[in-house]
Structures are given as C-alpha cells and as structure tokens.
C-alpha cells in the first residue's frame, strides 16, 4: 500500500520565497514520519526534511543548505522555503515515509511542482525611465 501525494503543478517564488503544500492520502496525526522535499527530475537533492514524532514539535533541517521550515496538517506538510535563487528554478517532489506504527509506508512518486524563482527587478527611477514600450 502506497500513500498518494498531491502537489500544485507550478508555483512562482516571488521575493525568493515560496510555500509548497504536500497533501497526502494518509492522516499523519499521532504518527512518526519523515517528510522531505527533493529537487530535480531525479530527486537527487534533498532540499528539506521535516521529522514528526507523535504530534510533538517538528524537527526541520537541510543537509543541502536550503532555508526551510515546515507546518503539519492532519494530512499535509507545508514546506516554507526562503532565500531561493533564480538558478534553483526546478521541479520539486514531496516524499513521505511513515515509520511508526507499523507497517512502514511511503508514497507513490508524485507529479512534482515546478517552482519558478523570479529574480528581484528594481523599478526604474522616475528620473531615468526604462525604455519605452511600443
């Protein structure tokens, strides 16, 4: 039995920050679980890990330098990412593993979310307007 995961197909990170909600076909309440977010088609980069243990405080970390936080819902984990760079535009996949109680469960690979990181554009000064548009 596999947990199903739903994610938004695409998100735009304005101000170099984004919230990505991973919705599961499984209630995480009173479970020990490890939710993670992975970057790239091959999910090679583990962006963020959220470890939950029986409704206690979530433990959040990244082995790859991403600034992240997590929030738990009954059937969801939302990953909050800050200080993203334009070159981190990519597809991101939610993963979930339930360690306790048995049996161990994980998810079917989701369709992923394309996160498009928009660069910060400075508004042109009124004294020096940008090129006029036709």
């Amino acid at each position: 039995n596999k947990i199903l995961v739903k994610q938004s197909p695409m998100l735009v990170a304005y101000d170099n920050a984004v919230n990505l909600s991973c919705k599961y076909s499984y209630n995480l309440f009173s479970r020990e679980f490890r939710a993670s977010l992975h970057k790239g088609l091959d999910s090679a980069v583990e962006v963020c890990v959220v470890y939950g243990n029986y409704s206690q405080q979530l433990q959040v970390y990244s082995k790859t330098g991403f600034n992240c936080d997590g929030k738990l819902g009954n059937e969801s984990v939302t990953f909050y990412l800050q200080n993203l760079y334009v070159n981190q535009t990519d597809i991101y996949f939610c993963k979930i593993e339930v360690m306790y109680p048995p049996p161990y469960l994980d998810n079917e690979k989701s369709n992923g979310t394309i996160i498009h990181v928009k660069g910060k554009h400075l508004c042109p000064s009124p004294l020096f307007p940008g090129p006029s548009k036709p």
Epitope: L58, V60, G70, N83, Y85
Partner: antibody
Framework: EVQLVESGGGLVQPGGSLRLSCAAS????????IHWVRQTPGKGLVWVSR????????SHADSVRGRFTISRHNAKNTLYLQMNSLRAEDTAVYYC?????????????WGQGTLVTVSS | EIVLTQSPATLSLSPGERATLSCRAS??????LAWYQQKPGQAPRLLIY???NRATGIPARFSGSGSGTDFTLTISSLEPEDFAVYYC?????????FGQGTKVEIK
C-alpha cells in the same frame, strides 16, 4: 524596550544536563522566531538552535542535534534550551536572540548571555 | 556550510580615521549578509543587514556594501565607542554562519 535575559548557566560535568531559560519583554514574543547562539574563544559565534513563532517547529545545528531541545512558552514569554549529554566542547556563553518570522536568521536583538562550563 | 573569512584579524587605528573591514564568503550569499559589533562583556549588536541597510538606531558613519562573495563594512570616522570586535554573518544558506571577527583597536 526589547529585552532578552538568559539564565540557568553554570558548571556541569561531562554527560550531565542543564536547562537554560530566556525571559523576553518589550515586544510581542509570539510573533518572533527565537534562537540560541553560542560563543567560545576558539570557535567564535556559532548558531545552535531555533524555534518558530508558535513553537511547532525547531532546527538544531548538527553538533547538538539529538542532545539539545529548544522549546518556548508564549504565555510566559520564555524560551528554553534543554541540554543533555553535555560535552567539554559545549562550554560557551549562550545567547538568546530573536529574528522576525519573515527574515528567519537576521538577529536584531540579543540577550547578555549565560556561561555554561562543562568540566570534570 | 558557508565559511566567512574576515580580514584583517586586527585593525589598529586612531579616532577620526576611516576603518574598512572585509568579509569574504566561500560561495555567493547574494546580499544576505549582516554585520554585528561586540564590545567586551557585551552581546553582539546588529549594525547592518542585507549587506547595506543600517539597523535601527545605528549612526550614519557605519555603512555596508558588497554582494555575492565580497563585502565591506566602513566606519567613516572612528569614534572612541567604535573600538570593538566586528562580525559578519550570512543567512543565505542554512545553517547561518559567522565570520571569525575583526578587532578594531586604538593605535
């Protein structure tokens, strides 16, 4: 006036435990992330742990993960750091500091620090 | 994790002189860099955040510049109370890290 006041430091033997507290005043405590940063003469300033504004999530540096636990009591405007399995290298001055919940690691106010000495 | 290297380790100057402190990151931190001042027996105090923004109550003689990997803190004219240790800190990548500090001492 924003104030953060640490307490609970002292001398403890290796393998022992200690609980630090940080009492906050002068701002809306429940709106801020709170952190512990430690300072040693050898390693300088090192970020240790953080807790988000409602206490639902936390992060720890690799060097303390599994040994230290950060928590907060928003009704009491107080932050805690439970330190277990202490090692000599945990000897430091421990500061609590805050950051806005929109700029997670910009430390705009700091307490005066409390000294933890781990020695036999 | 990102390593921040500050130079020089010590800067010996007289009141009224200009101080230029450097902080170099092991990889780009964009503009997510802060500067702190610490006096003996006191906690660090935020001076500059996001490379060039002065924190609340910080005098105009303190200014920050740079982006990417190279940053500078400038004190345009040293006052007696400015003699202290200065640290840079990045929040671009997790975990946040600090430089080892530059001591500005009276010549």
């Amino acid at each position: 006036e924003v104030q953060l006041v640490e307490s609970g430091g002292g001398l403890v033997q290796p393998g022992g435990s200690l609980r630090l507290s940080c009492a906050a005043s002068g701002f809306t405590f429940s709106s801020y992330w709170i952190h512990w940063v430690r300072q040693t003469p050898g390693k300088g300033l090192v970020w240790v742990s953080r807790i988000n504004s409602d206490g639902s999530s936390a992060s720890h540096a690799d060097s303390v993960r599994g040994r230290f636990t950060i928590s907060r009591h928003n009704a009491k405007n107080t932050l805690y750091l439970q330190m277990n399995s202490l090692r000599a290298e945990d000897t430091a001055v421990y500061y609590c500091t805050r950051s806005d919940s929109s700029t997670w690691y910009k430390f705009d106010y700091w307490g005066q620090g409390t000294l933890v000495t781990v020695s036999s | 994790e990102i390593v921040l290297t500050q130079s020089p380790a010590t800067l010996s100057l007289s009141p009224g002189e200009r101080a230029t402190l450097s902080c170099r990151a092991s990889q780009s931190v964009s503009s997510y860099l802060a500067w702190y001042q610490q006096k003996p027996g006191q906690a660090p105090r935020l001076l500059i955040y996001d490379a060039s923004n002065r924190a609340t109550g910080i005098p105009a003689r303190f200014s920050g510049s740079g982006s990417g990997t190279d940053f500078t803190l400038t004190i345009s004219s040293l006052e007696p109370e400015d003699f202290a240790v200065y640290y840079c800190q990045q929040r671009s990548n997790w975990p946040p890290t600090f430089g080892q500090g530059t001591k500005v001492e009276i010549k």
